[in-house]
Interface confidence: medium
């Protein structure tokens, strides 16, 4: 939704205000692995980077593994995703308020290249899971998110039978499947090489753009 | 601009099929799943089933399993559901409706009113 | 696997009120809700955790809690008198359910 980032007026190069995001973008020379994308402009630490790496991080205690051991090519996305979560300083156009224990602000309908969720759904959707959205419904009792009674672990494809029940339905609709391909400078890409720059600063600004905020 | 437009209205006879068409625009079609949901006159909605407009896979409700069949032509852009068996219960206003996660439905088409009459 | 919603609610003008839907799919899934108006296809009013799609005014929320789902409308207008309907994902069998529908009466 165009105008989710209604409290905010920078938009640009902006963090959000969440559980483990610097409060103002910079450097960060060791962003880890995956993160790495991100270290010439980031809100995100070194450490946090590191964590999230992890197979139930102690930045949120969620366990990928929930249904079994997620494969390697579909868990990468899910890093990757993170990655995107923690560390971009460019979605302040999909900054959206919220009323949560954990965090004050949330991404909603951030637009993500089409190829990124494709191949995001056709990397997973042979793992296992119990849930089709995965903010709601778990079962926290022993700290780690469990499947709750009831909840059959069952292919990817099953909970998320298209890429965009995946994209759009796994965190509530932080992302929207763009119409737009990588390089277009009109999707977010999950996705980049930092040797030609971060292209989401350029979607960022288009966005901001649109809405008449500078 | 996202759009779903729907074939015009039927008449049928008991024991006839009727097919519907649902063509979309304005999206990328295969990335998202089509739904139909019916609603007789007076009465509240009703899901009939979704396919799958990327691969293809279908999945019906109980109560029309057996009578309903839903398919999609990509290069058209376009998804159908076709009921059997009619009878005069099946008189109803039929959507299609895009889902952006799972039940949730953000693009519907204008509908297509259904009338079984001898 | 049901949805129940009130037939009937209503509000004066400006005022508030709350259409809720239960059901056992709702502890594990968020509900949608749907304005539809006579002789008019259904609208997507929120859907997910708390989401409003671009054209939806601020005066629509929704929440959840357990098994319950409410639609809060804050300031009803007369525009809003129309039929509510919730739905959600049945996650067993990959269905989707819908409640029986609110007709809200704006006084």
């Known amino acids: 939704t165009m105008c989710s980032a209604q409290d905010r007026t920078d938009l640009l190069n902006v963090c959000m205000d969440a559980k483990h995001h610097k409060t103002k973008p910079g450097p960060e020379d060791k962003l880890h692995d995956q993160c790495s994308p991100w270290k010439k402009n980031a809100c995100c630490t070194a450490s946090t980077s590191q964590e999230l790496h992890k197979d139930t991080s102690r930045l949120y205690n969620f366990n990928w593994d929930h249904c079994g051991k997620m494969e390697p090519a579909c868990k990468r996305h899910f890093i990757q995703d993170t990655c995107l979560y923690e560390c971009s300083p460019n979605l302040g156009p999909w900054i959206q308020q919220v009323n949560q224990s954990w965090r004050k602000e949330r991404f909603l309908d951030v637009p993500l290249c089409k190829e990124d969720c494709q191949r995001w759904w056709e990397d997973c959707h042979t793992s296992h899971t119990c849930k089709s959205n995965w903010h709601r419904g778990w079962d926290w009792t022993s700290g780690v998110n469990k499947c709750p009674a009831g909840a059959l672990c069952r292919t990817f494809e099953s909970y998320f039978p298209t890429p965009a029940a995946l994209c759009e339905g796994l965190w509530s609709h932080s992302y929207k499947v763009s119409n737009y391909s990588r390089g277009s400078g009109r999707c977010i890409q999950m996705w980049f090489d930092s040797a030609q720059g971060n292209p989401n600063e350029e979607v960022a600004r288009f966005y901001a753009a649109a809405m008449h905020v500078n | 601009e996202v759009q779903l437009v729907q074939s015009g209205a039927e008449v049928k006879k008991p024991g006839a099929s009727v097919k519907v068409s649902c063509k979309a625009s304005?999206?990328?079609?295969?990335?998202?799943?089509m739904h139909w949901v019916r609603q007789a006159p007076g009465q509240r909605l009703e899901w009939m089933g979704w396919i799958n407009a990327g691969n293809g896979n279908t999945k019906y409700s109980q109560k029309f399993q057996g009578r309903v069949t839903i398919t999609r032509d990509t290069s058209a852009s376009t998804a159908y559901m076709e009921l059997s068996s009619l009878r005069s219960e099946d008189t109803a206003v039929y959507y299609c409706?895009?889902?952006?996660?799972?039940?949730?439905?953000?693009?519907w088409g204008q509908g297509t009113l259904v009338t079984v009459s001898s | 696997m049901e949805l129940t919603q009130d037939p009937a609610v209503s509000v004066a003008l400006g005022q508030t009120v709350r259409i809720t839907c239960q059901g056992d799919?709702?502890?594990?899934?968020?509900a949608n809700w749907y304005q539809q108006k006579p002789g008019q296809a259904p609208v997507l009013v929120i859907y997910?955790?708390?989401n409003r799609p671009s054209g939806i005014p601020d005066r629509f929320s929704g929440s959840s809690s357990g098994n319950t789902a409410s639609l809060t409308i804050t300031g009803a207008q007369a525009a809003d008198e129309a039929d509510y309907y919730c739905?959600?994902?049945?996650?067993?069998?990959?269905?989707?359910?819908f409640g029986g529908g609110t007709k809200l009466t704006v006084l």
């Open positions: 304005g999206y990328t079609f295969t990335s998202y799943a």
């Open positions: 739905d959600s994902r049945v996650s067993t069998g990959n269905h989707v359910v």
């Open positions: 409706a895009r889902d952006i996660s799972y039940g949730s439905f953000d693009y």
């Open positions: 799919s709702l502890r594990s899934n968020y």
């Open positions: 997910g955790q708390n």
